[in-house]
Amino acid sequence: KSSNEATNITPKHNMKAFLDELKAENIKKFLYNFTQIPHLAGTEQNFQLAKQIQSQWKEFGLDSVELAHYDVLLSYPNKTHPNYISIINEDGNEIFNTSLFEPPPPGYENVSDIVPPFSAFSPQGMPEGDLVYVNYARTEDFFKLERDMKINCSGKIVIARYGKVFRGNKVKNAQLAGAKGVILYSDPADYFAPGVKSYPDGWNLPGGGVQRGNILNLNGAGDPLTPGYPANEYAYRRGIAEAVGLPSIPVHPIGYYDAQKLLEKMGGSAPPDSSWRGSLKVPYNVGPGFTGNFSTQKVKMHIHSTNEVTRIYNVIGTLRGAVEPDRYVILGGHRDSWVFGGIDPQSGAAVVHEIVRSFGTLKKEGWRPRRTILFASWDAEEFGLLGSTEWAEENSRLLQERGVAYINADSSIEGNYTLRVDCTPLMYSLVHNLTKELKSPDEGFEGKSLYESWTKKSPSPEFSGMPRISKLGSGNDFEVFFQRLGIASGRARYTKNWETNKFSGYPLYHSVYETYELVEKFYDPMFKYHLTVAQVRGGMVFELANSIVLPFDCRDYAVVLRKYADKIYSISMKHPQEMKTYSVSFDSLFSAVKNFTEIASKFSERLQDFDKSNPIVLRMMNDQLMFLERAFIDPLGLPDRPFYRHVIYAPSSHNKYAGESFPGIYDALFDIESKVDPSKAWGEVKRQIYVAAFTVQAAAETLSEVA
């Protein structure tokens, strides 16, 4: 159970006092306050919100609250020269133009400074040419086009539907295929759930709605001009030609009304199979180009956005620990939004605000956490996780020595069906134990635990009677803490029923229609799911900051390491002949995993038995737990991805949002049959097995008895 030496509240009541102080009504009030105007990164509106949060966190009782600013590369549309796409006839006349803005939702008609839909960091350009429909623009979609259908995208403008993978991966794939422009659109198959009305009458995407978003391929670099180092006032900045991760071809997003006008004229090849068809009344022909009558017409993009070094502001609040002030538990989520941010990020920011208020209330009553808690309101997450990454770069030496855990707090909801958790295996037991103590908010589960409803609705594919917990990928502010610094991390939110709702994300994601009313009317009128997420996130932070022994179970890492080793071995075994030819063996990896399992088991036994009243031994054991995640970091990073340094987990090279296990080996094996030099390719597989085996063994040894 939680305990703390420095409190005047009985230890067993600490967590209860904290959780009882969290109120749904407050979260609702905070959400309303945070969503009345846009808070785009780099604007005065967002700076004012930063100052408001700073002021309120001080009032709530934090020891200190500071603004940390950085000057980073952002991207904005040209205010006087809007972006759009045309269909042009043989004379070059524009016979159709896409819309310049989304029709504003009811009640927001008079709001200024709504940034029109754009793809952040698109270069300028006015390419024109034939269109090719590339489905979701995934790696496998381009394989299908190029290898099976023999369709060449070189010099073409490609149109891809949003969904399945991070948009930056789509653009990278299109670039590699030789495309000269990319049009991204939201297909109703992915963003319009059957039987639900479009906003404002329901939570579906209207035809004029458009998803904004950045199209970078940063691979964890942060500010594109200052990779590895903070974008402070004396920073050396790269030239734009050397900037990290910028796309090289113009990109623009549109809604499905405009997409219909482009896709209905498509000719050329028929779609290869039904998985390439969306829900529009169009043939989903792949192209290239328009059909017969329209074959002389072309598509032209008009992109005039600019990249600008802009000041951003994080808010960093500190609640000093009473016993171990040099150990940091961090709760962070972003503040910047594309427009109103009704879900992303303010449903998360409102929860963080209430968690801070609750902690502050306890502190005012004389309580302090055992360890220091840092609260962060990150800026410019939407532009590539920039605020969190720059702050972590600036504070990396402190964080790598003192960072216990990072809990992410972006959108609290993406649905209202069940809980969704992604975290390090070290936190599995913490999450299980916590959710067993919390009440489920779900209908039909009154009086039951959150663990029970979660397990019923989202069962683990491997272990019966347990809920699914996913791998951490990226696309959010935990990235730098986990993937670069090796700080144990986790995230939790309420999600949809993935089995019945096969659309990507939630329909109104990053559109102007992501408003307070969307949440209050359609997702969570009672704010009970928000409250549950506050309890999960806040409860995790409380336990991590307050438990005498850190609530990490290293045995759960052993279990997943074996699972991941089995998985990567089975992928490799699809090439038995080559494995034999090039003497590829996984013995070293399986041996390391076995050693890890045995050492972790022994460590856990010692953890039960040691003298917890001896502060030196306690600190020693806790440090072994804290530094275990750090031990999976390879200082050299992954091939061509120096800021992804975690050997067990990395964002997938094909989808930034997804986590991949043993990513070094996985990428070395990917499409290996097509490599021009098989000997070199299999040599890299062997090298990656070696790196993984060494890292697992080295991590195991950090858990051994110290002497």
Epitope: I37, P38, L40, G42, T43, E44, Q45, N46, F47, H69, D71, L74, Y76, K79, T80, N110, V111, S112, D113, V115, E233, E308, V309, T310, R311
Partner: antibody
Framework: EVQLVQSGAEVKKPGASVKVSCKAS????????ISWVRQAPGQGLEWMGE????????YYNEKFRGRVTMTTDKSTSTAYMELRSLRSDDTAVYYC??????????????WGQGTTVTVSS | DIQMTQSPSSLSASVGDRVTITCRAS??????LNWLQQKPGKAIKRLIY???SLDSGVPSRFSGSRSGTDYTLTISSLQPEDFATYYC?????????FGGGTKVEIK
Amino acid sequence: EVQLVQSGAEVKKPGASVKVSCKASGYTFTSYGISWVRQAPGQGLEWMGEIFPRRGNTYYNEKFRGRVTMTTDKSTSTAYMELRSLRSDDTAVYYCARVFDGYYNYAMDYWGQGTTVTVSS
Amino acid sequence: DIQMTQSPSSLSASVGDRVTITCRASQDIGSSLNWLQQKPGKAIKRLIYATSSLDSGVPSRFSGSRSGTDYTLTISSLQPEDFATYYCLQYASSPYTFGGGTKVEIK
């Protein structure tokens, strides 16, 4: 407390130049720009342009382009506005005002006390 | 350039009166409009930004509203310290332009 303190009154002859200063305090100078606005006797306000010290960018009202130069000295948190080829109708009170440095802003929030420039032969 | 037509150019009122001042924009400026107060010998003060948001320290008797391209500053109950000249400012597009001003005098 945010303060913008401007230099004293100036009397200039037609054809001469004037350089007005605006010393800022109470905030991070590089997080904001400085706008310059003038007001002729008995007249309304007229925006001349703005400068953003962090980036060094200037944006001038076309009416004054070629005659006005706005600069800053970050080490002293001071902005300057120089107007050349003065004419009698340049006689006015010249104000500096703070403006947030960002893609969207709310324009001028704090103003200096004004500097009277008289152009007379 | 966007023209801002402010009316009336002057008005006389008594303490406690409700006063309204209007600015009409020659084209759409959204909510990118501020209201400023100028008193002789004092620095200009911003009262309202973004059409209706009150600056900190400004009394709640001041309010701003919009109907189409017409923008209104209302003083619900005029106080002695409110006698001054008021200007609107549009900052939707450069060059930023001001209304001609309204002088509020004691009746």
